[in-house]
């Protein structure tokens, strides 16, 4: 058993039929010695008396809020949560496996630049009685500070018969050095509590591996005289690291017809303009990627050819 926060404790249980469970001793936080009784949750049934209460925790019915009283007055509370271990593996019931980039991916993280700010998100089908706490650091043995905010419900989607909820959190490395070579990964730890169930999830990454630039901005077309060609121009996204001479992007320019089956023309360039042929009813899209490190491409920025 360990303390998650003040008066909230996690009991770690091997979860199998007829498991013996864990013996837990609760102590009433009071100078009083006599006339103390214990109850669980909203029940008025007295579980025991005395300054300490010994219980055998085997299942969720044994978890909950234990309260010690004296003469009708509440003295203190202790909330017991359960963390299940089945076949040697901690349960992952609360979050959904996103299966990308690989199985057992519960947390996904992205950064728009090298500033040390990143966003992580996760999915669940649970709508209520759910809370999260997020901690992060660079490295684990001698951790350097990363500040994370509160988890926020960022999207709700309908997936077939189920509703899916996306939570996200923003974090900022306290003393980030954008130009430095990373040697220690960022560690992200999410504590999840649903009703009386506790779970934790972790992710480890280098900022360089989770970079995904915003799409190029100010995408414009300039027709070239007496030609079907157009000059496409764009700018670096505002959120990208500066100076651009050091933090450089490469771009992919795509001409796509109305039909998905039509051939796509693609041009790759390090410049912020390109000359392409504009077909009728086609659209021109541009996306960006770090020029020197193959992390994710940005989403497309698009304009119609007309």
């Amino acid at each position: 058993i360990w303390e998650l926060k003040k008066d909230v404790y996690v009991v770690e249980l091997d979860w199998y039929p007829d498991a013996p469970g864990e013996m837990v001793v609760l102590t009433c936080d009071t100078p009083e010695e006599d006339g103390i009784t214990w109850t669980l949750d909203q029940s008025s049934e007295v579980l025991g008396s005395g300054k300490t209460l010994t219980i055998q925790v085997k299942e969720f019915g044994d978890a909950g809020q234990y309260t010690c009283h004296k003469g009708g007055e509440v003295l203190s509370h202790s909330l017991l949560l359960l963390h299940k271990k089945e076949d040697g593996i901690w349960s992952t019931d609360i979050l959904k496996d996103q299966k990308e980039p690989k199985n057992k991916t519960f947390l996904r993280c992205e950064a728009k630049n090298y500033s040390g700010r990143f966003t992580c998100w996760w999915l669940t089908t649970i709508s209520t009685d759910l809370t999260f706490s997020v901690k992060s650091s660079r490295g684990s043995s001698d951790p350097q500070g990363v500040t994370c905010g509160a988890a926020t419900l960022s999207a709700e989607r309908v997936r077939g018969d189920n509703k899916e909820y996306e939570y996200s959190v923003e974090c900022q490395e306290d003393s980030a050095c954008p130009a430095a070579e990373e040697s220690l990964p960022i560690e992200v730890m999410v504590d999840a509590v649903h009703k009386l169930k506790y779970e934790n999830y972790t992710s480890s990454f280098f900022i360089r591996d989770i970079i995904k630039p915003d799409p190029p901005k100010n995408l414009q077309l300039k027709p070239l005289k007496n030609s079907r060609q157009v000059e496409v121009s764009w700018e670096y996204p505002d959120t990208w690291s500066t100076p651009h001479s050091y933090f450089s992007l490469t771009f992919c320019v795509q001409v796509q017809g109305k039909s998905k089956r039509e051939k796509k023309d693609r041009v790759f360039t390090d410049k912020t303009s390109a000359t392409v042929i504009c077909r009728k009813n086609a659209s021109i899209s541009v996306r960006a990627q770090d020029r020197y490190y193959s992390s994710s491409w940005s989403e497309w920025a698009s304009v119609p050819c007309s």
Partner: nanobody, 122 residues
């Protein structure tokens, strides 16, 4: 407990700008929505702007003039108020709705800041 602390109110001339901030603090809490409400003397409290599930919404009277935004790493929500009018004079309250873990279990919360006065007058 989740605490909300507002700042940024004050006296401004018509056409001027102000930026309100609201910082949420606490432990083990998840935010479902954050927003700004206002209450003018003798009137009902009304929603000015809110962010929920990643979507922003605004009262018709402030659309195009006010912008709500969040800094998630700092648990802070902002209200940038431009082109202020005398009818924007009110006490502005920050609101946060979500769930938190207490020793009673996971419970919903609906917290309000103490309010910050915005006066638009020449």
């Amino acid at each position: 407990e989740v605490q909300l602390v507002e700042s940024g109110g004050g006296l401004v001339q018509p056409g001027g700008s102000l930026r309100l901030s609201c910082a949420a603090s606490g432990s083990f809490f998840s935010i479902k929505s954050m927003g700004w409400y206002r209450q003018a003397p003798g009137k009902q409290r009304e929603l000015v702007a809110g962010i929920a599930s990643g979507v922003t919404n605004y009262a018709d009277s402030v659309k195009g003039r006010f912008t709500i935004s969040r800094d998630g790493a700092k648990n802070t929500v902002y209200l940038q108020m431009n082109s202020l009018k005398p009818e924007d004079t009110a006490v502005y309250y920050c609101n946060a709705v979500g769930e938190r873990l207490a020793n009673t279990g996971v419970t919903e919360y609906d917290y309000w800041g103490q309010g910050t006065l915005v006066t638009v007058s020449s």
